[in-house]
């Protein structure tokens, strides 16, 4: 990603509010000017900043990928919040994409956890109760999963 072409869009437009930095920092929703004298507001829906900062450019808003739903839009002080669509999940160790949840557990196992936006269905052995960590079941039973609702921000 090259920011070169984005830089002009993130400079101060006439309608953008300006204020003076406090101890060299600008408040959330702003970035500092090139000469360090002014705080310039981020552009709603385009970029944002979440903390007091001396950033020369506001952070670009995340755009939800296909396969994701937007739970809340990007504001000048908060990034977009994206969530995997129903029936898909995002693991912590592979946050770049939503993966399809399994439709059921392998034979000899029972489902103890539903598909949520951040986890696959959870299966355990009927007898031992130990979790199944395999990616793809050898044989699937017709055990359906119901999607969860809680949200998780995507970066």
């Amino acid at each position: 990603i090259t920011q070169q072409d984005l830089a002009p869009q993130q400079r101060a437009a006439p309608q953008q509010k300006r204020s003076s930095p406090s101890e060299g920092l600008c408040p959330p929703g702003h970035h500092i000017s090139e000469d360090g004298r002014d705080c310039i507001s981020c552009k709603y829906g385009q970029d944002y900043s979440t903390h007091w900062n001396d950033l020369l450019f506001c952070l670009r808003c995340t755009r939800c990928d296909s396969g994701e739903v937007e739970l809340s839009p990007c504001t000048t002080t908060r990034n977009t919040v994206c969530q995997c669509e129903e029936g898909t999940f995002r693991e912590e160790d592979s946050p770049e994409m939503c993966r399809k949840c399994r439709t059921g557990c392998p034979r000899g196992m029972v489902k103890v956890g539903d598909c949520t936006p951040w986890s696959d269905i959870e299966c355990v052995h009927k007898e031992s109760g130990t979790k199944h960590s395999g990616e793809v079941p050898a044989v699937e039973e017709t055990v359906t999963s119901s999607p969860g609702t809680p949200a998780s921000p995507c970066s």
């Epitope: 060299g24 090139e34 900062n53 001396d54 950033l55 020369l56 450019f57 952070l59």
Partner: nanobody
Amino acid sequence: EVQLLESGGGLVQPGGSLRLSCAASGSTFSSLDMGWFRQAPGKGREFVSAISRSGDNIYYADSVKGRFTISRDNSKNTLYLQMNSLRAEDTAVYYCAVDSQPTYSGGVYYPRYGMDVWGQGTLVTVSS
């Protein structure tokens, strides 16, 4: 502790070109996010350009966009600023700087005004 040494400044006529260099030592150059700032006589420090450690993220001030080009050669531990179509208002001491507390978001580098490691500067004078 990283140390920076700028060179390449001098007197040039309006419309002319200069190439500034910044040699870095004392640190792993390829891990440094860096920038160029300038200070005109009697004025404050002004951001000119910045580049991420990989060279993938590049930024320019409006006043130099289309005329200046920042680049780096990690194998030579050197940062460059190619300045074309120079104007009288580009006259300033140019400083190379390191952003030792860089901001990354979504894998993208965002430069700060308060870069905290500086060279001694090189004077660029644009005059006929």
